[in-house]
Interface confidence: medium
Amino acid sequence: VQNSCDNCQPGTFCRKYNPVCKSCPPSTFSSIGGQPNCNICRVCAGYFRFKKFCSSTHNAECECIEGFHCLGPQCTRCEKDCRPGQELTKQGCKTCSLGTFNDQNGTGVCRPWTNCSLDGRSVLKTGTTEKDVVCGPPVVSFSPSTTISVTPEGGPGGHSLQVL
């Protein structure tokens, strides 16, 4: 028991007229000692679930349930995950800009279309906001040093292989 509210630790409250440090009641917290009241803990319900439970010194933290994502500071609201052809920004789901795509649901980003010409290939099928460009086969003329593009497993990016 302290004789001054200034000496109270987080997790307690203290009234000036009766300067005794008292523990915060259940479901309340105080991150700074010496305050006249403890704060009510946040409850994560509905589209929210607990990320961190409340303690006597820290408020609870919420996150969104599966299929939803947080918006606003301290996850003040939940919004449904974005569709293919969109990306999540601070303002919510936005359509991919021209020249980019996202082929997945969720909170991923729109990625730039593959640049077929960097690999010496032509565009076989133009890209959309949901699908990447499809590149044609490489133009292979076996000169002394020829570069063949090899598409890596599962994705449209390109590795280069030197054939000497």
Partner: antibody, heavy 120, light 110 residues
Framework: EIQLQESGPGLVRPSQSLSLACSVT?????????WSWIRKFPGNKMEWMGY???????NSNPSLKSRISITRDTSKNQFFLQLKSVTTEDTATYYC?????????????WGPGTMVTVSS | QAVLTQPNSVSTSLGSTVKLSCTIT????????VHWYQHYEGRSPTTMIH?????PDGVPDRFSGSIDSSSNSAFLTINNVEIEDEAIYFC?????????FGGGTKLTVL
């Protein structure tokens, strides 16, 4: 614990190619995330160079597009940087790092960095 | 292309509060999340704040992040500054399919 470690020559001649490897332990690079290269120039300017995604997709900084190639060896859990036609302006500390294209989109694990000097 | 601008250096005294700024040009702070990294020379950078104001586990609550729409800026505030806070602090954002970094602020603790 996830760890990344860069390796490669500390000195490269102008007009040659710079080649670096990043070895990842504690996480499989084909599971998730985008595996990035970042460099820090003398004077502290930091530049994102590009990444190879877990599915093999690559993306790079438009300022480097014509010179950069990022590849990987999934059997060794490594990814690589090749930067062609280097000049003294490419002298920097090179870092590999893990980035998520999903929220939250930040670099959560970094290698210690490797200093590369371009000089004749 | 968007640019993140930070002051080159900031000095502060032990035990005080310091606020580091990161201003976005050719972009909107309300559209893009900002992240902050602490970097000691010769070591790996570590994340101090992500998504404007989120603190990763293990980062002291002396560190906090905020944004101000009117100045189009993000801020990293360090309360009760300690000697070990002396480092370079970088801000970072993902804008138009590109990761961009600020020039870094060297924080000196007097």
């Amino acid at each position: 614990e996830i760890q990344l470690q860069e390796s490669g020559p500390g000195l490269v001649r102008p007009s040659q190619s710079l080649s670096l490897a990043c070895s990842v332990t504690g996480y499989t690079i084909t599971s998730a995330y985008d595996w990035s290269w970042i460099r820090k120039f003398p004077g502290n300017k930091m530049e994102w160079m590009g990444y190879i995604a877990y599915i093999g997709f690559t993306n790079s900084n438009p300022s480097l597009k014509s010179r950069i190639s990022i590849t990987r060896d999934t059997s060794k859990n490594q990814f690589f940087l090749q930067l062609k036609s280097v000049t003294t302006e490419d002298t920097a500390t090179y870092y590999c790092a893990r980035w998520s294209s999903y929220i939250p989109r930040y670099f959560d694990f970094w290698g210690p960095g490797t200093m590369v000097t371009v000089s004749s | 292309q968007a640019v993140l601008t930070q002051p080159n250096s900031v000095s502060t005294s032990l035990g005080s509060t310091v606020k580091l700024s990161c201003t976005i040009t050719s972009g909107n702070i309300e559209d893009n999340f900002v992240h902050w990294y602490q970097h000691y020379e010769g070591r790996s950078p570590t994340t101090m704040i992500h998504n404007d104001d989120k603190r990763p586990d293990g980062v002291p609550d002396r560190f906090s992040g905020s944004i101000d729409s009117s100045s189009n800026s993000a801020f990293l505030t360090i309360n009760n500054v300690e000697i070990e806070d002396e480092a370079i602090y970088f801000c970072h954002s993902y804008v138009s399919s590109i990761n961009i970094f600020g020039g870094g602020t060297k924080l000196t603790v007097l």
